[in-house]
């Protein structure tokens, strides 16, 4: 703001008074400017924090979107499965021998539920099993498969403790472990295991076992397998047969080293691995450098981490 120029000479007192007023005014303006500058600095800082938060939010959102995208693949078909499962539950009796009982995805298949997706298995008081949400594969090799493990997005850590592996974790439409207690219950009848794998070049392979049993917790969820068939090269689960389950906090392996800590997962570690299907999910570029990845020795060796894996079970006597 410019100082006013007087054409006529003013009286000295008036001049001094005007001067003082102008100085005051200038001081006030400087104070205002300082305040404004301080406010601007604060705003800039707030904006910067906000931008950082937004970037973090965007990163988080993109991860969420990636998860949603992978889920979306099966969403449409799953909507069909939401046809009131209460009808299904009402039809079920609590007797173990009942032909109407729903134990797993094969039971659902026999009741003409032929769409792959998420179903709720009703509780069974006789077997002492709670209600359980499962993902059913109703298409592969005749269908009726209950998926017990899936690795496809890498958004879920599998370096978990004994309790988490016992109860299960992850997202039923994404990456998950169904839970050792549930898998043990599901394998109490003669059961078949199928392991499906995909590498980073898009090749698909499978391994099937004529017999699959998971012992109870007292037996440390020990793995028992029957004969192998498949196209994945060497059988990389046989080495883990008759081996107890180990996690980072429960060392049940046959090794002086703690395999669960070395291989970063929960698994039937021997000393240590021919396969490590619950290992670390490594993305393309990092997928062939690590011993603790999702490995299957008989196919790509001990340092190649696979892109996708699913483990699924169904009764041995299942007929499509």
């Amino acid at each position: 703001q410019k100082l006013s120029k007087h054409k006529t000479p003013a009286q000295p007192q008036l001049k001094a008074a005007n001067c003082c007023e102008e100085v005051k005014e200038l001081k006030a303006q400087v104070a205002n400017l300082s305040s404004l500058l301080s406010e601007l600095n604060k705003k800039q800082e707030r904006d910067w924090v906000s931008v950082v938060m937004q970037v973090m939010e965007l990163e988080s959102n993109s991860k969420r979107m990636e998860s949603r995208l992978t889920d979306a693949e099966s969403k449409y078909s799953e909507m069909n499965n939401q046809i009131d499962i209460m009808q299904l539950q009402a039809a079920q009796t609590v007797t173990q021998t009942s032909a109407d009982a729903i134990y797993d995805c094969s039971s659902l298949y026999q009741k003409n539920y032929r769409i792959s997706g998420v179903y709720k298995l009703p509780p069974d008081d006789f077997l002492g099993s709670p209600e359980l949400e499962v993902f059913c594969d109703m298409e592969t090799s005749g269908g009726g498969w209950t998926i017990i493990q899936r690795r496809k997005s890498g958004l879920v850590s599998f370096y978990r403790d004994w309790k988490q592996y016992k109860q299960g974790f992850g997202s039923i439409r994404g990456d998950f472990w169904l839970g050792n207690e549930h898998i043990h219950r599901l394998s109490r009848q003669p059961t078949r295991l199928r392991v499906e794998m995909e590498d980073w070049e898009g090749n698909l392979r499978y391994a099937e076992y004529s017999h699959f049993v998971l012992g109870n917790e007292l037996n440390s969820y020990r793995l028992f397998l029957g004969n192998y068939t498949g196209n994945v090269g060497n059988d990389a689960l046989q080495y883990h047969n008759n081996t107890a389950f180990s996690t980072k906090d429960k060392d049940n392996d046959n090794c002086l080293d703690k395999c669960a800590q070395l291989r970063k997962g929960g698994y039937w570690y021997n000393c240590c691995t021919d396969s490590n299907l619950n290992g670390v999910y490594y993305r393309l570029g990092e997928h062939n450098k690590h011993l603790d990845g999702i490995t299957w020795y008989g196919w790509h060796g001990s340092t190649y981490s696979l892109k996708r894996v699913e483990m699924k079970i169904r009764p041995e006597d299942f007929k499509p």
């Epitope: 046959n254 002086l256 080293d257 021997n270 000393c271 240590c272 021919d274 011993l291 060796g301």
Partner: antibody, heavy 125, light 107 residues
């Protein structure tokens, strides 16, 4: 040069206790698992116990389980075998051994590559 | 526990002979087998590990083979210093176990 020297052997009465030590030198002690093996007079070798490098994992032969305790002090480069409730059949030369590890296709292979000269334990009344 | 059975329990041989010692496991142990040599009053010495890998410093006349349940230690041309007792040992699972030993003495 890698060296293992056992000590602490001697004559002890049945039911008594003894603590064997094994002083290690010439290698990074904490990086290796260690083991105890014994040999009764005129008999073959019998594995007794093993311990991981950190001391977190220990294993025992059924014949000594509950009576013997393997431990290590990595700051002193020393392996120990605490032997309680000793029996006549525990009479033997006790060897300590360094356990080497090799990895093939994701499997770890263990073997005892360096042995001490042994210390004699006699359990007799 | 895995039992290890060696045969023969003793063998008489001459310098220059080819000597073969076998070791059988009561169940499959993959390649988790080591061979040791022991001379009277001395500590055992590692010869072979992982069924067929020769330990550093061990003469090449010693060789190991086998996998699963049946294993062999071969001395291609016996030398005077080779007269000793030989033990196989499995490290497939705990407890680790030794064979009962095979004594190689002079014919």
């Amino acid at each position: 040069e890698v060296q293992l020297v056992e000590s602490g052997g001697g004559l002890v009465q049945p039911g008594g206790s003894l603590r064997l030590s094994c002083a290690a030198s010439g290698f990074t002690f904490s990086s290796y698992a260690m083991s105890w093996v014994r040999q009764a007079p005129g008999k073959g070798l019998e594995w007794v116990s093993a311990i991981s490098g950190s001391g977190g994992s220990t294993y025992y032969a059924d014949s000594v389980k509950g009576r013997f305790t393997i431990s290590r002090d990595n700051s002193k480069n020393t392996l120990y075998l605490q032997m309680n409730s000793l029996r006549a059949e525990d009479t033997a030369v006790y060897y300590c051994a360094k356990v080497e590890r090799d990895m093939v296709r994701g499997h770890y292979y263990y073997y005892m590559d360096v042995w001490g000269k042994g210390t004699t334990v006699t359990v007799s009344s | 526990d895995i039992q290890m059975t060696q045969s023969p329990s003793s063998v008489s041989a001459s310098v220059g002979d080819r000597v073969t010692i076998t070791c059988r496991a009561s169940q499959g142990i993959s390649s988790w087998l080591a061979w040791y040599q022991q001379k009277p009053g001395k500590a055992p010495k590692l010869l072979i590990y992982a069924a067929s890998s020769l330990q550093s410093g061990v003469p090449s006349r010693f060789s190991g083979s086998g996998s699963g349940t049946d294993f062999t230690l071969t001395i291609s041309s016996l030398q005077p210093e080779d007269f000793a007792t030989y033990y196989c040992q499995q490290a497939n699972s705990f407890p680790w176990t030794f064979g009962q030993g095979t004594k190689v003495d002079i014919k």
